[in-house]
């Protein structure tokens, strides 16, 4: 399977909600010992390998934010932490796999990534992620509402195994 | 602290049922996997039943599948084991653990609770 | 399934001795991701399970250094370099790499 990211740059204003998006394209495995674990997480730019460094999001991990779950079925963090945080990971039965940022800073711009694990009785198979940029811009030059900028057809399907 | 207590064990008949509870406390319950082990009389340790974070995955080995439930209450830090059709091979101390989780792979159970005995036993 | 045998079955030691406890499996328990899921655990009188050694030869945290693990394949081994009283007990070695997950049959670390 691989992870698409269909947008690369969201660039919001202060105060603005924004949903960053990734999602599982391919061949998933629905048998009853198959599981996905997807989670998202902070990185830098100029590394050799993108994504390979993880920073909170927030002050929450990506173990803080993590989904686990069937093939494609619907799940979103339930925990209070992440909600008190004004933050919320969701899958849906499409694989689209998602985390809301609600009222962001200029704090919140940055590389993010998106994980997902194929997991077969608890133990990983596959990984993949996707990485996209979040500007968060304040002034007269900042968009009233969240621009997003589609990925090129080759970055959209990033399949680096992390 | 990390903390797992057990409860629910009692003496049964065979072919009865019995429901185990453990509940969580010192960390984020519904970010880490979690299982049952036993103990048989004799000491050897069985493992029973593991379910994944969010309760959407379980698995059994063939001697308890079909006959053991494993379940877990996220919102009340609890994790269950609803065994049916018990058997006097089933008479053990019944450990829950928390999983060291990287990534969704389980490898390792880093805390134990103290147990909870069931006897079955005409 | 896959089959730990654990020896020796009890193990009499004298304090400030090297202890060796050998785990062998029925067959390879090299996972197709290439970790190898072999585990073990020290259960002291009256208390619960403790883990030890995770994937073969990490300690978890708190563990004492005196505590290494290793081996590979069918054949791991655990070594207690220098036995303490607090070692005394029942070790476990586990499989996860394939299910059902199963453990040995415990070897007993006593005083000579």
């Known amino acids: 399977f691989k992870v698409a990211t269909p947008y690369s740059l969201y660039v919001c204003p202060e105060g603005q909600n924004v949903t960053l998006t990734c999602r599982l394209l391919g061949p998933v495995d629905k048998g009853h010992d198959v599981t996905f674990y997807k989670t998202w997480y902070r990185s830098s730019r100029g590394e050799v390998q993108t994504c390979s460094e993880r920073r909170p999001i927030r002050n929450l991990t990506f173990q803080d934010l993590h989904l686990h779950h069937g093939g494609h079925q619907a799940a979103n963090t339930s925990h209070d932490l992440a909600q008190r945080h004004g933050l919320e990971s969701a899958s849906d039965h499409h694989g689209n796999f998602s985390i809301t940022m609600r009222n962001l800073t200029l704090l919140d711009s940055g590389l993010y990534c998106c994980l997902v694990v194929e997991i077969r009785h608890h133990h990983s198979e596959h990984r993949v992620h996707g990485a996209m940029e979040l500007q968060v811009q304040t002034g007269k030059d900042a968009p009233s509402n969240c621009v997003v900028y589609p990925s090129s057809s080759q970055d959209s399907e990033n399949i680096t195994a992390a | 602290e990390v903390q797992l207590v057990e409860s629910g064990g009692d003496l049964v008949k065979p072919g009865g049922s019995l429901k185990l509870s453990c509940a969580a406390s010192?960390?984020?319950?519904?970010?880490?996997?979690m299982s049952w082990v036993r103990q048989t009389p004799d000491k050897r340790l069985e493992w029973v039943a593991t379910i994944n974070s969010g309760g959407s995955y379980t698995y059994y080995p063939d001697s308890v599948k079909g006959r053991f439930t494993i379940s877990r209450d996220n919102a009340k830090n609890t994790l269950y084991l609803q065994m049916s059709s018990l058997k006097s091979e089933d008479t053990a101390m019944y450990y829950c653990a928390r999983h060291e989780d990287y990534e969704g792979d389980y490898y390792a159970m880093n805390y134990w609770g103290q147990g909870s005995s069931v006897t079955v036993s005409p | 399934d896959v089959l730990m045998t654990q020896s020796p079955l009890s193990l009499p030691v004298s304090l400030g001795d090297q202890a060796s406890i050998s785990c062998r499996s029925s067959?390879?328990?090299?996972?197709?991701?290439?970790?190898?899921?072999l585990e073990w655990y020290l259960q002291k009188p009256g208390q619960s399970p403790k883990l030890l050694i995770y994937?073969?030869?990490n300690r978890f945290s708190g563990v004492p250094d005196r505590f290494s693990g290793s081996g590979s394949g069918t054949d791991f081994t655990l070594k207690i370099s220098r036995v303490e009283a607090e070692d005394l007990g029942v070790y476990y070695c586990f499989q996860t790499s394939h299910v059902p997950w199963t453990f040995g049959g415990g070897t007993k670390l006593e005083i000579k």
């Open positions: 994937k073969v030869s």
């Open positions: 067959q390879s328990i090299l996972h197709s991701n290439g970790n190898t899921y």
């Open positions: 010192g960390f984020t319950f519904s970010s880490y996997g």
